[in-house]
Interface confidence: low
């Protein structure tokens, strides 16, 4: 893993004045033990609105690696395997919580951060805008 | 909001032996200020694999409210507006991090938890699984 130098300005984790601060145990409890590990591994390829997955890495964030979906086409794949531009591939986005090291490089202090990620793509009927 | 009684067994947030613990500032920084608030508000209805959104609430979790997508149909909507069962609506799932109060009802101590949520649905070509 990456060794992050300790910032001398990191707050003392026992500082009672640390704003709206809570203690968080990083031993992650995974509630997904019974889920099929292949649950959606190939949907990105089999979808009528297929997508590619791009790795987004940031050592100052926890989790440091997030996978971002990018739709492959503007249109959707039809029954013949061709791109149909009468439909649109659009990203399904979700706001997720991550932990951001704050101040930077501090090993034991974080701020909650909300980021928007594209999880996959779906095929939608386009909205027709009528020009006045 | 719900007032959660303090559990007398809550760990002291200054306890140096608290396992793999970090300080987290809950003043959320939102990186999504420039995003279009309507970004996917109607995709659930316009998709060829439409979905409904179900509210999942848990006061012991942060965030306490998570919206779960449930695909409306087994098949996908075709050009005529009918359900085509030769294609499948499937949920796009993502593992997200949440904070779980631990021990329960403690206002200032949490454990990171990974949960699987369905964000929306996409239309895929069916796959044949051979049974051993």
């Amino acid at each position: 893993g990456i060794t992050i130098p300790r910032n001398p300005g990191c707050p003392n984790s026992e500082d009672k004045n640390f704003p709206r601060t809570v203690m968080v145990n990083l031993n992650i409890h995974n509630r997904n033990t019974n889920t099929n590990p292949k649950r959606s591994s190939d949907y990105y390829n089999r979808s009528t609105s297929p997508w590619n997955l791009h790795r987004n890495e940031d050592p100052e964030r926890y989790p440091s690696v997030i996978w971002e979906a990018k739709c492959r086409h503007l249109g959707c794949i039809n029954a013949d395997g061709n791109v149909d531009y009468h439909m649109n591939s659009v990203p399904i986005q979700q706001e997720i919580l991550v932990l951001r090291r704050e101040p930077p490089h501090c090993p034991n202090s974080f701020r909650l951060e909300k980021i928007l990620v594209s999880v996959g793509c779906t095929c939608v009927t386009p909205i027709v805008h009528h020009v006045a | 909001g719900i007032t959660i009684p303090r559990n007398p067994g809550c760990p002291n947030s200054e306890d140096k032996n608290f396992p793999r613990t970090v300080m987290v500032n809950l003043n959320i920084h939102n990186r999504n200020t420039n995003t279009n608030p309507k970004r996917s508000s109607d995709y659930y209805n316009r998709s060829t694999s439409p979905w409904n959104l179900h509210r999942n609430e848990d006061p012991e979790r942060y965030p306490s409210v998570i919206w779960e997508a449930k695909c409306r149909h087994l098949g996908c909507i075709n050009a005529d507006g009918n359900v085509d069962y030769h294609m499948n609506s499937v949920p796009i799932q993502q593992e997200i991090l949440v904070l779980r109060r631990e021990p329960p009802h403690c206002p200032n101590s949490f454990r990171l938890e990974k949960i699987l949520v369905s964000v929306g649905c996409t239309c895929v070509t069916p796959i044949v699984h051979h049974v051993a």
């Epitope: 292949k38 089999r46 | 409306r72 149909h73 087994l74 098949g75 009918n82 359900v83 069962y85 030769h86 294609m87 499948n88 499937v90 895929v124 069916p126 796959i127 044949v128 699984h129 051979h130 049974v131």
Partner: antibody, heavy 124, light 107 residues
């Protein structure tokens, strides 16, 4: 265990009507598509109609406009309303449901469970 | 409608014989082909789904193969309880269609 029990068959004159029922149990009825399949005496199997979980309906051409497939999810029941009956509609009518397993993303639409059948005779 | 043609319409075989029944579609049904067994006075029983998958509880002497338009049901070693009529079914497109059936009789 999946159970399908048909009822409502009988003797009817040409041009008459009958309503077949199928009581389903042992599976989450509202989640599955259901079908009616018939078999004329001494003949092969013939698909009649399917209703999807969301109520969408599909019919063979020879019964379109005469037969109506419907469902009551609260009662776990499937129905086939048959109007303007003809001699060629004489058959044993089976109610059928798809498999209950789910492997990946397979459109589960082939009949896996069948009722015992109910005989419809159209004759003057 | 997609037409399915089974061959032969009937066959006579002995216990222990290997039997193959074919089902030909007049257009592609991809992998949406299934096989049923029916005995007189009884409801059909699903044997094979999606070309080659054995339904739970079906003896492994029954197997399916093929793709697109040509499909086969094979009984590797015919048993006394296998004498029945066999049907193929396509669920690729409405209206769903069955083959006309193949009657397997004792020689």
């Amino acid at each position: 265990e999946v159970q399908l029990v048909e009822s409502g068959g009988g003797l009817v004159q040409p041009g008459g009507s009958l309503r077949l029922s199928c009581a389903a149990s042992g599976f989450p009825f509202s989640d599955y598509s259901m079908a009616w399949v018939r078999q004329a005496p001494g003949k092969g199997l013939e698909w009649v109609a399917t209703i999807g979980p969301s109520g969408d309906t599909y019919y063979r051409d020879s019964v379109k406009g005469r037969f109506t497939i419907s469902r009551d999810n609260a009662k776990n029941s499937l129905y086939l309303q048959m109007n303007s009956l003809r001699a060629e509609d004489t058959a044993v009518y089976y109610c059928a449901s798809p498999p209950q397993y789910y492997e990946g993303s397979i459109p589960r639409l082939w009949p896996a469970h069948w009722g015992q059948g109910t005989l419809v005779t159209v004759s003057s | 409608a997609i037409q399915l043609t089974q061959s032969p319409s009937s066959l006579s075989a002995s216990v222990g014989d290997r039997v193959t029944i074919t089902c030909r579609a007049d257009e592609s049904v991809r992998t949406l082909m299934h096989w049923y067994q029916q005995k007189p006075g009884k409801a059909p029983k699903l044997l094979i789904y999606l070309v080659s998958n054995s339904e739970i509880g079906v003896p492994d002497r029954f197997s399916g193969s093929g793709s697109g338009t040509d499909f086969r049901l094979t009984i590797s070693s015919l048993q006394p309880e296998d004498f029945a009529t066999y049907y193929c079914l396509q669920t690729h497109s409405y209206p769903y269609t069955f083959g006309q059936g193949t009657k397997v009789e004792i020689k």
